[in-house]
Interface confidence: low
């Protein structure tokens, strides 16, 4: 019989108290082969950081500063269970900090030296660690004492509970530094009124204070808010314009053999029984004997973690940088205006060999990073271990989500001004043999089908998503016999055709064979009936255009389209017999790499793009055997976006709201991570 | 593989200068990119810019403005054009090949050409 | 990125060891390669630079292997084992780790 108890950490007799009602009470409603309480007393938040990891206790409630240390090695533990505030609608399980500024001021993020700054107090997250933590590297040297950088760096400060004596500059805007209610510019409301005031320039507070303090709009308008990118926005796009996202209040639990499915049952039970206003007798959101014991006594319920997020994931790519760089107090040397190299995300062993490969003829200004599928890459971009890769528009979608933004588009035809004119999109086509004259749009069920990838546009996202509107559910698998659509689960139907060997079978990546367009192409060739590509597939495989023996000696003239209508059409005229039109591969990154990308890959084309005529003693940025590696073959150049700039702009409505419905079959893991930090 | 410069041996302050280095044994289109040096008076070293193989150029940042790079396969040379010189361009200028891997070290120079700007 | 040659000159009798060095400002050493993006140039009395050394440390076809080149990170050193008369020439390094590539000043070897 598994063991279903799951060992809660307690840091004071309180909390212990606590626990034992917690454990009493839940054995009074949970049958006896639910889960159980038992509670272990450890001296800190820390001591119980390294229980857990040593497996003498399972689950503790932390801070988000704490989440960092619990992900740090050795511990390796990751959020499970998150505390939501609000309502159930609309629950709330983080916060923004931001940087909240007068209208009329007129300087950006990067202009705040020499600025009054407002702090909420010294050492707490919305008002010191995060941004002085994201400042950090801009401190001047050296930085430590922190609170004298600081001092040197803004020309007055109000930072509430800093040592006045030492660092008289950190209380010139609140004489003294008192750190309580009683210094007029403590704290979130504090630190605005600072602003309001005049005595500061900037007040780093958390998203709702400025609402909490003007309930007016016409009052929150005076103010705007500092965007890490240097721009500014209105106050109520915070999520769009802040300095960290930060997790309330978070369980958490070994990353390995942590219990997770066993806290969640336990938790969502407990807030069943003794949620808010669900008990008398005890209450899970309450501390009669002092203060947040166990969990926020703010906290409303609490929601699953999704299993993909881990905890850098889960306190974002800001926040981490900054409370790592103030832990670690590291930074590049002396900063240039030069870009730094940009780390290339490929996908298995042919897009390393290839982007090695780019990486020496870059010179340095193009490194490898590796990962084995196309969600492991967005992560690493979200992380920042890696900087950019160009994707195909399902995944433009997922990376969107997560927060990641288009910098430029492949661009498929030739035109004198190929850069500056970013195309409309490709055709997302069905192609059948000529010799399976029967087969038509309106009779694919039991059908043998080829993708490109699960979630890619073309080869999924297009297809399946007309396919779900008309058989209303979610069961592919069952409606073709069998086929290969890499990134599906192992068992099943549509991995059968998959022709990759071992752990590569079905894997979305060029380890599987029919992975990408041509791998689609291949499958309908050697075992399908149906392969979901795009419309220039055909005609760069056929006519011995690609000289791989599968594919030498085809002829275009053996293959056809799938109409809408029910009718079937050569393969040239794709135009007037296609699924949709898809929007071209783009490259993505994240918001601060945005520049440097750019105008990195515009060197990189310039040197290696489409004018290079002979790629077999040079290196091809948009070559590699029709194998798509890096940028799909075709590629002429990447092109600006101009004003298509965001993940919805570029994907257009229309594809976003398809993409939207076929969510409800979404087997994305990161992307249910995503939509969890930003619904 | 041989490279030979050739141009004015004078040229005014604020004139233009244009150079150009021949390539014989190896066509520019093949392969490799195909750069411009200079050697100040004092010795001093400096990369100017090259022509790819395939058309592209890159230049020195310091010099981007009034630089230019160019071609003609037919011929097999490659051109470098310098606007509103000043006495500081005075200099013995090399054309260079690269040796691709490794990228930028130039296995392959010309004599060099010395040009003088001076009224 | 700056290279400072030193010494700026020396005098050896033929058959001495010389070594001089040439110390980057920033890394040549390339993580992803592993590969330290370093040139060795002689020019000798009135004519053009001769690539000596590639890679921080591999001879040039027809180099004579009297000359080494060692060092990783921000140090080099191209080392001539033995001198002889024909080695008088100034010795420049290059790196070619960013744009734009970049010589040191160089360092000029002369016969006692």
């Known amino acids: 019989v598994p063991d279903k108890t799951v060992r809660w950490c307690a840091v004071s007799e309180h909390e212990a108290t606590k626990c034992q009602s917690f454990r009493d009470h839940m054995k009074s409603v949970i049958p006896s082969d639910g889960p159980s309480v038992a509670c272990v007393k450890k001296a800190s938040y820390l001591d119980c950081i390294r229980a857990i990891a040593a497996n003498e206790a399972d689950a503790v409630t932390l801070d988000a500063g704490l989440v960092y240390d619990a992900y740090l090695a050795p511990n390796n533990l990751k959020p499970v269970v998150a505390e939501f505030y609000g309502s159930k609608e609309d629950p709330q399980t983080f916060y923004y900090a931001v940087a909240v500024v007068k209208k009329d001021s007129g300087f950006q993020m990067n202009q705040l030296r020499g600025k009054k700054s407002c702090h909420t107090g010294l050492g707490r997250s919305a008002g010191w660690n995060i941004p002085i933590g994201l400042l950090y590297c801009d401190l001047p040297e050296p930085r430590k004492p922190l609170e004298k950088a600081v001092a040197n760096f803004f020309s007055g400060s109000c930072a509430p509970c800093a040592d006045g004596t030492d660092f008289p500059q950190l209380c010139q805007l609140c004489p003294g530094c008192g750190c309580s209610t009683l210094n007029q510019y403590f704290g979130y409301s504090g630190a605005f009124k600072c602003l309001k005031d005049g005595a500061g320039d900037v007040a780093f507070v958390k998203h709702s204070t400025i609402f909490e303090n003007l309930a007016n709009k016409a009052d929150r308008d005076q103010y705007e808010l500092l965007c890490l990118d240097n721009t500014r926005k209105p106050v109520d796009e915070y999520k769009d314009c802040h300095l960290a996202q930060v997790p309330s209040h978070t369980v958490v639990a070994r990353s390995m053999g942590g219990k997770e499915d066993l806290i969640w049952e336990l938790l969502n039970q407990a807030q069943e029984h003794f949620g808010k206003d669900k008990s008398k007798e005890f209450q899970l959101f309450s501390s009669p004997h002092g203060k947040d014991l166990l969990f926020k006594d703010s906290a409303h319920g609490f929601l699953k973690v999704p299993p993909r997020m881990d905890a850098k994931m889960y306190l974002g790519y800001e926040y981490v940088t900054a409370i790592r760089n103030l832990r670690e107090g590291t930074c590049p040397e002396a900063p240039t205006d030069e870009c730094k190299p940009v780390k290339w995300c490929a996908l298995s062993h042919h897009e390393r060999l290839k982007c090695d490969e780019w990486s020496v003829n870059s010179v340095g200004k193009i490194e490898c990073v590796s990962a084995e599928t196309t969600e492991d890459c967005i992560a690493k971009i979200m992380n920042g271990e890696a900087d950019a890769m160009s994707l195909d528009g399902g995944f433009v979608y997922i990376a969107g989500k997560c927060g990641l933004v288009p910098v430029l588009a492949e661009n498929y035809n030739k035109s004198d001004n190929c850069e500056d004119t970013p195309e409309a999109g490709y055709f997302a086509i069905a192609v059948v043999k000529k010799s399976a004259s029967d087969l038509t749009w309106d009779n694919l069920k039991g059908k043998k089908s080829c993708h490109t990838a699960v979630g890619r546009t073309a080869g999924w996202n297009i297809p399946m998503g007309l396919l779900y509107n008309k058989i209303n559910h979610c069961r592919f698998d069952e409606f073709f016999s069998e086929g290969c659509a890499p990134g599906s689960k192992k068992d099943s139907s549509l991995c059968k055709l998959c022709m990759g060997s071992g752990l590569n079978l079905c894997e979305p990546n060029n380890k599987e064979g029919y992975y990408g367009y041509t791998g689609a192409f291949r499958c309908l060739v050697e075992k399908g009936d149906v392969a979901f590509v795009k419309h220039q597939t055909v005609p760069q495989n056929t006519g011995g255009k690609n000289p791989d023996p599968w594919a030498k000696n085809l002829n275009e003239k053996d293959y056809e389209l799938l109409c809408l209508d029910g009718t079937r059409k050569p393969v040239e005229e794709y135009a007037n017999c296609h699924l949709a039109r898809a929007p071209n591969h783009a490259v993505v990154t994240r918001k601060d790499k945005e520049a440097c990308v750019h105008k990195i890959l515009r060197q990189q084309q310039h040197l290696f793009g489409s004018n290079v005529t002979d790629c077999s003693g040079n290196f091809c940025l948009f070559r590699s055997e029709t194998k798509d590696l890096l940028f799909r073959d075709d590629t002429v150049c990447l092109a600006k976006l101009h004003d298509r700039n965001t993940y919805e702009k570029y994907l257009g409505e229309e594809y976003v709201k398809a993409v939207g419905n076929l969510r409800k079959c979404s087997t994305s893991s990161l992307l249910e991570a995503c939509t969890f930090r930003r619904p | 593989v041989q490279l030979q410069e050739s141009g004015p041996d004078l040229v005014k302050p604020s004139q233009s200068l244009s150079l150009t280095c021949t390539v014989t044994?190896?066509?520019?289109?093949?392969?490799?990119?195909w750069h411009w040096i200079r050697q100040f008076p004092e010795n001093k070293l400096e990369w100017l810019g090259y022509?790819?193989?395939?058309?592209?150029?890159n230049y020195s940042p310091s010099l981007k403005s009034r630089f230019s790079i160019t071609r003609d396969t037919s011929k097999n040379q490659f051109f470098l054009q310098l606007n509103s010189v000043t006495t500081e361009d005075t200099a013995t200028y090399y054309c260079?090949?690269?040796?691709?891997?490794?990228?930028?070290?130039?296995?392959?120079w010309g004599q060099g050409t010395t040009v003088t700007v001076s009224s | 990125i700056e290279l400072t040659q030193s010494p700026s000159s020396l005098a050896v009798s033929v058959g001495e060891k010389v070594t001089m060095t040439c110390k980057s400002s920033?890394?040549?050493?390339?993580?992803?390669?592993?590969?330290?993006?370093l040139a060795w140039y002689q020019q000798k009395p009135g004519q053009s630079p001769k690539l000596l050394i590639y890679?921080?440390?591999t001879r040039e076809s027809g180099v004579p292997d009297r000359f080494t080149g060692s060092g990783s990170g921000t140090d080099f050193t191209l080392t001539i084992s033995s001198v002889k008369a024909e080695d008088l020439s100034v010795y420049y390094c290059?790196?070619?780790?960013?744009?734009?590539?970049?010589f040191g000043s160089g360092t000029k070897l002369e016969i006692k």
């Open positions: 260079a090949r690269d040796g691709y891997s490794p990228p930028y070290a130039m296995d392959y």
């Open positions: 044994g190896y066509s520019i289109t093949s392969g490799y990119s």
């Open positions: 022509i790819h193989s395939s058309g592209a150029t």
């Open positions: 920033q890394s040549l050493l390339y993580s992803t390669n592993q590969k330290n993006y």
């Open positions: 890679w921080a440390s």
């Open positions: 290059q790196q070619y780790y960013s744009y734009p590539p970049t």
